[in-house]
């Protein structure tokens, strides 16, 4: 039987400074149970970009409606992009536990930032 897949369809996204970047992520199953989180970079030094349950992420909004049932779309939008936001963003599925453990990561989407049009 098919195991959950994390799909990030865009290998790269280019956004002008000051605009919003949409980073797409979908999953193919509602199980295993556990949250989705977004990170910039990989490895122990990766930066948490969005965690739905905890934290304050004022520039990040979820693309899917908050009341959408059986949601498998975990795309996010990051507003007011600056050159400092450039990097590779990963959508990561966690397995619920104490603590939650990483189950599977998407392949990543590289965000590049263009100069603001004059």
């Amino acid at each position: 039987e098919e195991e959950l897949q994390v799909i990030q369809p865009d290998k790269s996204v280019s956004v002008a400074a000051g605009e919003s970047a949409i980073l797409h992520c979908t999953v193919t199953s509602l199980i295993p149970v556990g949250p989705i989180q977004w990170f910039r970079g990989a490895g122990p030094a990766r930066e948490l970009i969005y965690n739905q349950k905890e934290g304050h992420f004022p520039r990040v909004t979820t693309v899917s409606e908050s009341t959408k049932r059986e949601n498998m779309d975990f795309s996010i939008s990051i507003s007011n992009i600056t050159p400092a936001d450039a990097g590779t963003y990963y959508c990561v599925k966690f397995r619920k536990g104490s603590p939650d453990t990483e189950f599977k990561s998407g392949a990543g989407t590289e965000l590049s930032v263009r100069a603001k049009p004059s």
Partner: antibody
Framework: EVQLVESGGGVVQPGGSLRLSCAAS????????VSWVRQAPGKGLEWVST??????YYADSVKGRFTISRDNSKNTLYLQMNSLRAEDTAVYYC???????????????WGQGTLVTVSS | EIVLTQSPATLSVSPGERVTFSCRAS??????IAWYQQKPGQAPRLLIY???SRDTGIPDRFSGSGSGTDFTLTISSLQSEDFGVYYC??????????FGGGTKVEIK
């Protein structure tokens, strides 16, 4: 139409075992978490166990005695109950988990339940 | 474990009356609350999820509100088929999923 049909309940002596089954239809069983919730006679609802893929979760009151499992090829959920106690006497409901937005889980469909009576 | 306290335990009401049920959580559960109706001898039925979203096919006389620790289920005009027991459930932090003790609605 989503349907959940429990079976396997009955009368068992304290210390005995019982295996409950829940046959599911009307939805893509293999991609959903499913759960068991019980209700003692005249009492409220108590969550028992949930299974995702191979990830399983239990209430403290049944941990080490009950085992939840699933067979996706048969669209069936199971609950193996060992070392049964009088306080396990209840109607056992099978329930389909649902999610909303980035959150979960609640129970959007329930079976009609199967009664387990633990008595000597 | 998050404890849900429902009040009152029993409500005696007449058809046509407005009914309000309370569910209080022992800690913040955001909007991760569901409400169920259970009639005697039947399985629970999902009414409301995400504190205020009605499930498919649920009449609009049922409404939910609240966030954080205090939640309310309201029936704007009670119908005869609405008698039964109403339970809230939190799914913010689990295991375990927890249910309130229920509020029984009986005919006055």
């Amino acid at each position: 139409e989503v349907q959940l049909v429990e079976s396997g309940g009955g009368v068992v002596q304290p210390g005995g075992s019982l295996r409950l089954s829940c046959a599911a239809s009307g939805f893509s069983f293999s991609i959903y978490a499913v759960s068991w919730v019980r209700q003692a006679p005249g009492k409220g609802l108590e969550w028992v166990s949930t299974i995702g893929a191979d990830d399983t979760y239990y209430a403290d009151s049944v941990k080490g005695r009950f085992t939840i499992s699933r067979d996706n090829s048969k669209n069936t959920l199971y609950l193996q109950m060992n070392s049964l106690r009088a306080e396990d006497t209840a109607v056992y409901y099978c329930a389909k988990d649902s999610t909303v937005g980035w959150s979960g889980d609640f129970f959007d469909y329930w079976g009609q339940g199967t009664l387990v009576t633990v008595s000597s | 474990e998050i404890v849900l306290t429902q009040s009152p335990a029993t409500l005696s009401v007449s058809p046509g009356e407005r009914v309000t049920f309370s569910c209080r959580a022992s800690q913040n559960v955001r909007s991760d609350i569901a409400w169920y109706q259970q009639k005697p001898g039947q399985a629970p039925r999902l009414l409301i999820y995400a504190a205020s979203s009605r499930d498919t096919g649920i009449p609009d006389r049922f409404s939910g509100s609240g966030s954080g620790t205090d939640f309310t289920l309201t029936i704007s005009s009670l119908q005869s088929e609405d008698f039964g027991v109403y339970y809230c459930q939190q799914y913010y932090d689990w295991p375990p999923f927890t249910f309130g003790g229920g509020t029984k609605v009986e005919i006055k």
